[in-house]
């Protein structure tokens, strides 16, 4: 019960980060005009990873497309890679995870690869999320660099007469909303990596072998000692030898409800 | 058509207060962006206040701040300006005008003008 | 506060003169994030209330007519009448559309010879 709770919580988080992962992608408050201590505008610039846009006190608001590739900032692209993988990462995460809930019943697909299929796509949450976490630090850097920079020049012009207002950029809420998305989405991940140990039977039986000897002593020999992983398939044990002897396995038996926590 | 009637003007001694008022129609009112601009018996232009449309940020001149001040009444397509404390500097005409929503902030629309003139 | 300075503060001309007039801004209008001048024209009367011209140091209101032509970008912006009609003889003021407070020139009158 506690296994299908945290393997639900997990999925659940992970699609609230990676939702969230894909909005801060698309939205175009990355970057906003710095209000503190700079002249009033009746214009509010704000940047996003596709396209820069400028709100008029008018109300109008007007947006441009970054349609160059090679000329943009080389860090805006890698910012724009880190979340297209944070995404992709996630949304094949989502798909394998829906596959692997315990709740989910699809065919016999035996608990194992339900398993193997939750690790999975919690690893692929963590890397989504960290990519994510990546992707935001990388471009809150650039504009703390940039910010610092313009302040230094914050008036450039000929001579002092003319004065040129460079417009400064601040945090926007995209980068919170990456922040804690991936955050979101690594936790998510986490959790599916915790259920998947608890989903993976605990196969830890001593198998024995008895036979009969032509004598009046009875000899007790060990079998072959499993730790069942969870991982790859799930073999039987084989017969040690076939004179009569018979392991305890190849009388077929399925794990019962009460087997896994 | 987009109409702007100013009204609420008139002669008021130093210190005093008035109110104006224009009556908006033709448009979405609460949309829009909405300033008052006076002009001097000098033919000077000085912007007064802007309120803007839908979030209601205000923008005061700096010779009126915390005297006066814009509102609306959206339901009564009405711009307002409350004016306190008024001094002799204050007498001028007084246009209710509309930021055009495509025209770079300019102000497509201006009311005829409702005159103020502060005198003892 | 941006300061508009224009010139001259007076123009006499005849009818189907080109006139031209001058507005400097103290600070750049042109906004870096979309490339576009924030500063606009107005004509007005006597007994009248300012009319929009030009917006966005270049763009004409619809309704103006082509022989008014706005250019220039960052400080220095210019007013053009290609023939000067009677019915252009006017008070022309430019504005600051970009910072707060929102300025405007003293004006340049344009007079009959």
């Known amino acids: 019960m506690a296994v299908t709770a945290c393997q639900g919580l997990g999925f659940v988080v992970s699609l609230i980060g990676i939702a969230g992962i894909i909005a801060a992608t698309c939205m175009d408050q990355w970057s906003t005009q710095d209000l503190y201590n700079n002249p009033v505008t009746a214009v509010f610039n704000y940047q996003g990873l596709w396209r820069s846009c400028v709100r008029e006190s008018s109300g109008f608001t007007e947006c441009r497309g970054y349609f160059t590739l090679l000329g943009l900032p080389a860090m805006l692209q890698a910012v724009r890679a880190l979340m297209i993988v944070g995404i992709v990462l996630g949304a094949i995460g989502l798909l394998v995870s829906i596959f692997a809930l315990k709740c989910i019943r699809i065919g016999s697909m035996e608990d194992s690869a339900k398993a193997n299929m939750t690790l999975t796509s919690g690893i692929m949450f963590i890397v989504s999320g960290l990519c994510a976490i990546a992707g935001v630090s990388v471009f809150a850097n650039m504009l703390v660099t940039n910010f610092w920079m313009s302040t230094a020049n914050m008036y450039t012009g000929m001579g002092g007469m003319v004065q040129t207002v460079q417009t400064r950029y601040t945090f926007g809420a995209a980068l919170f909303v990456g922040w804690v998305a991936g955050g979101l989405t690594l936790i998510g991940g986490v959790m599916m990596c915790i259920a998947c140990r608890g989903l993976a039977p605990e196969e830890t039986n001593y198998k024995a072998v008895s036979y009969h000897a032509s004598g009046h002593s009875v000899a007790y020999k060990p079998g072959g000692f499993k730790a069942s992983t969870g991982f790859g398939s799930n073999t039987k044990n084989k017969k040690i030898y076939d004179g009569g002897a018979r392991t305890e396995d190849e009388v077929q038996s399925y794990p019962s409800k009460h087997d896994y926590v | 058509e987009v109409m702007l009637v100013e009204s609420g003007g008139g002669l008021v001694k130093p210190g005093g207060s008035l109110k104006l008022s224009c009556a908006a129609s033709g448009f979405t009112f609460s949309s829009y962006t909405m300033s008052w601009v006076r002009q001097t018996p000098e033919k000077r232009l000085e912007w007064v206040a802007t309120?803007?449309?839908?979030?209601?940020?205000?923008y005061y001149a700096d010779s009126v701040k915390g005297r006066f001040t814009i509102s609306r009444d959206s339901a009564k397509n009405t711009l307002y300006l409350q004016m306190l404390s008024l001094r002799s500097e204050d007498t001028a005409l007084y246009y209710c005008?509309?930021?055009?929503?495509?025209?770079?902030?300019?102000?497509?629309?201006w009311g005829q003008g409702t005159s103020v003139t502060v005198s003892s | 506060d941006i300061l508009m300075t224009q010139s001259p503060s007076s123009l006499s001309v005849s009818a189907g003169e080109k006139v031209t007039m001058s507005c400097k801004s103290s600070q750049s209008l042109l906004n870096s994030g979309n490339q576009r001048n924030y500063l606009a024209w107005y004509q007005q009367k006597p007994g009248q209330p300012p009319k929009l011209l030009i917006y966005?140091?270049?763009t004409r209101e619809s309704g103006v007519p082509d022989r008014f032509t706005g250019s220039g970008s960052g400080t220095d912006f210019t007013l053009t009448i290609s023939s000067v009609q009677a019915e252009d003889l006017a008070v022309y003021y430019c504005?600051?559309?970009?910072?707060?407070?929102?300025?405007f020139g003293a004006g340049t009158k344009l007079e009959l010879k």
């Open positions: 005008t509309r930021l055009g929503q495509t025209q770079r902030n300019a102000m497509d629309y």
């Open positions: 504005q600051n559309d970009y910072y707060y407070p929102l300025t």
């Open positions: 966005g140091a270049s």
């Open positions: 309120i803007i449309g839908g979030y209601g940020n205000t």
